[in-house]
C-alpha cells in the first residue's frame, strides 16, 4: 500500500440486469486485480425524466481518472449514461452529478441510491 492513499478493498455492488447477467442484484463486491495496480469503485446511472435509475455499481480497475477521489462525482456534461469512480472502500454508496461546464447551480442533488 502507498501511504496517504485510500485503499479500495470493497465496493457496493448493484446490477439492474442481474437476471440476464446471472449475478446477484445487490451486495458488496470484493475488488481483485494485479497487486501492482490500484483499485476503485464505480457507479453508473441514468436520469429518466428526473428519476434516477441505477445501472451498475461495483469495482473498477486502475484508472487515473479515479485517483485520490474520495467522492463519486460525474463531471461530464449531460452524458447518456452517468459514470463516476472513486477511491476508498464503499465510496460508491453515494454518487452525484456536478457538470464542470455548468455555471449555474447543479440541478441534481447527491444521490443515496435505494435500488427498487
Amino acid at each position: 500500500a502507498i501511504l496517504g492513499r485510500s485503499e479500495t478493498q470493497e465496493c457496493i455492488f448493484y446490477n439492474a440486469n442481474w437476471e440476464r447477467d446471472r449475478t446477484n442484484r445487490t451486495g458488496v463486491e470484493s475488488c481483485y486485480g494485479d497487486k501492482d495496480k490500484r483499485r476503485h469503485c464505480f457507479a453508473t446511472w441514468k436520469n429518466i425524466s428526473g428519476s434516477i435509475e441505477i445501472v451498475k455499481q461495483g469495482c473498477w480497475l486502475d484508472d487515473i481518472n479515479c485517483y485520490d477521489r474520495t467522492d463519486c462525482i460525474e463531471k461530464k456534461d449531460s452524458p447518456e449514461v452517468y459514470f463516476c469512480c472513486c477511491e476508498g472502500s464503499m465510496c460508491n454508496e453515494r454518487f452525484s452529478y456536478f457538470p464542470e461546464m455548468e455555471v449555474t447551480q447543479p440541478t441534481s442533488n447527491p444521490v443515496t441510491p435505494k435500488p427498487p
Epitope: G33, D34, K37, F42, T44, V55, K56, G58, C59, W60, L61, D62, D63, I64, N65, K76, P79, E80, V81, Y82, F83
Partner: antibody, heavy 115, light 111 residues
C-alpha cells in the same frame, strides 16, 4: 487469467467496412476500458479510441473521428471496432487492449484492404 | 494530439545499460504520471514493461526502470540481454478524459 481473443483476419475492398471483435475473459468486463490500437506493416502503434465498457462512453482519435465506431456488448463481454470507408492505408494489424494502461492485449487481427 | 518523440534506434552490448527517451509536451508527458512503455518482438503483440512512468508490472525484471524529467520520460534497461532486442514504444494512459498517443518506436539492438 485475463485473455482478450480477437476475430480472424479479414480481406476487404476499398470503400467497404470491417468490424473486428475482442472477447474478454478472466476478469469483470464492465470494470474497465477497452482500447483499440492499430499497426500498419513496418510502422508504429497508433491509438484509435477507447470505450468505457460499463457506461458505453467512447473517445476517438481525431484522425479516425467519423470513420470508427467502438461498441461493447456486456452480455457477451465483447468489444467491437468498426472502421468504415476503408482505403489501402488502413491495411494493418488491429489490437484491442484492456484498461487505460493497456495492460493486456489481444493477439491482433490483420485487416487487408485491397481491390 | 501529436505523437510522442522517440529516437529511431539505440544499441548496446550485453551487460551494458541503455536509455530510451520519449519527449512530449507539458500537456501530455509533462502533466501527469501517465506514461507507459511497451516491448514488442516481431510478429507479437506489445507487452507492457512500465506504466505510470515508473511502476513495473509483476513479472517484468527489475532491470527495466522508468523515470521522467519535465516533458521527457525515459526507459532504462540495465544489464542488457539478447532477448531485450525488440521495438520499444512509449504511450500515454487512455480512458475517461484522457486521449491516447504513442511514440514512433525505438529499435533496440543488442550487439
Amino acid at each position: 487469467q485475463v485473455q482478450l481473443v480477437q476475430s480472424g483476419a479479414e480481406v476487404k475492398k476499398p470503400g467497404s467496412s470491417v468490424k473486428v471483435s475482442c472477447k474478454a475473459s478472466g476478469y469483470t468486463f464492465t470494470s474497465s476500458y477497452i482500447n483499440w490500437v492499430r499497426q500498419a506493416p513496418g510502422q508504429g502503434l497508433e491509438w484509435m479510441g477507447t470505450i468505457n465498457a460499463v457506461s458505453g462512453s467512447t473517445s476517438y482519435a481525431q484522425k479516425f473521428q467519423g470513420r470508427v465506431t467502438i461498441t461493447a456488448d456486456t452480455s457477451t463481454s465483447t468489444a467491437y471496432m468498426e472502421l468504415s470507408s476503408l482505403r489501402s492505408e488502413d491495411t494493418a494489424v488491429y489490437y484491442c487492449a484492456r484498461g487505460g494502461w493497456f495492460d493486456y492485449w489481444g493477439q491482433g487481427t490483420l485487416v487487408t484492404v485491397s481491390s | 494530439q501529436s505523437a510522442l518523440t522517440q529516437p529511431r534506434s539505440v544499441s548496446g552490448s550485453p551487460g551494458q545499460s541503455v536509455t530510451i527517451s520519449c519527449t512530449g509536451t507539458s500537456s501530455d508527458v509533462g502533466s501527469a504520471n501517465y506514461v507507459n512503455w511497451y516491448q514488442q518482438h516481431p510478429g507479437k503483440a506489445p507487452k507492457p514493461m512500465i506504466y505510470g512512468v515508473s511502476r513495473r508490472p509483476s513479472g517484468v525484471p527489475d532491470r527495466f526502470s522508468g523515470s521522467k524529467s519535465g516533458n521527457t520520460a525515459s526507459l532504462t534497461i540495465s544489464g542488457l540481454q539478447a532477448e531485450d532486442e525488440a521495438d520499444y514504444y512509449c504511450g500515454t494512459f487512455a480512458g475517461g478524459k484522457y486521449y491516447g498517443v504513442f511514440g514512433g518506436g525505438t529499435k533496440l539492438t543488442v550487439l
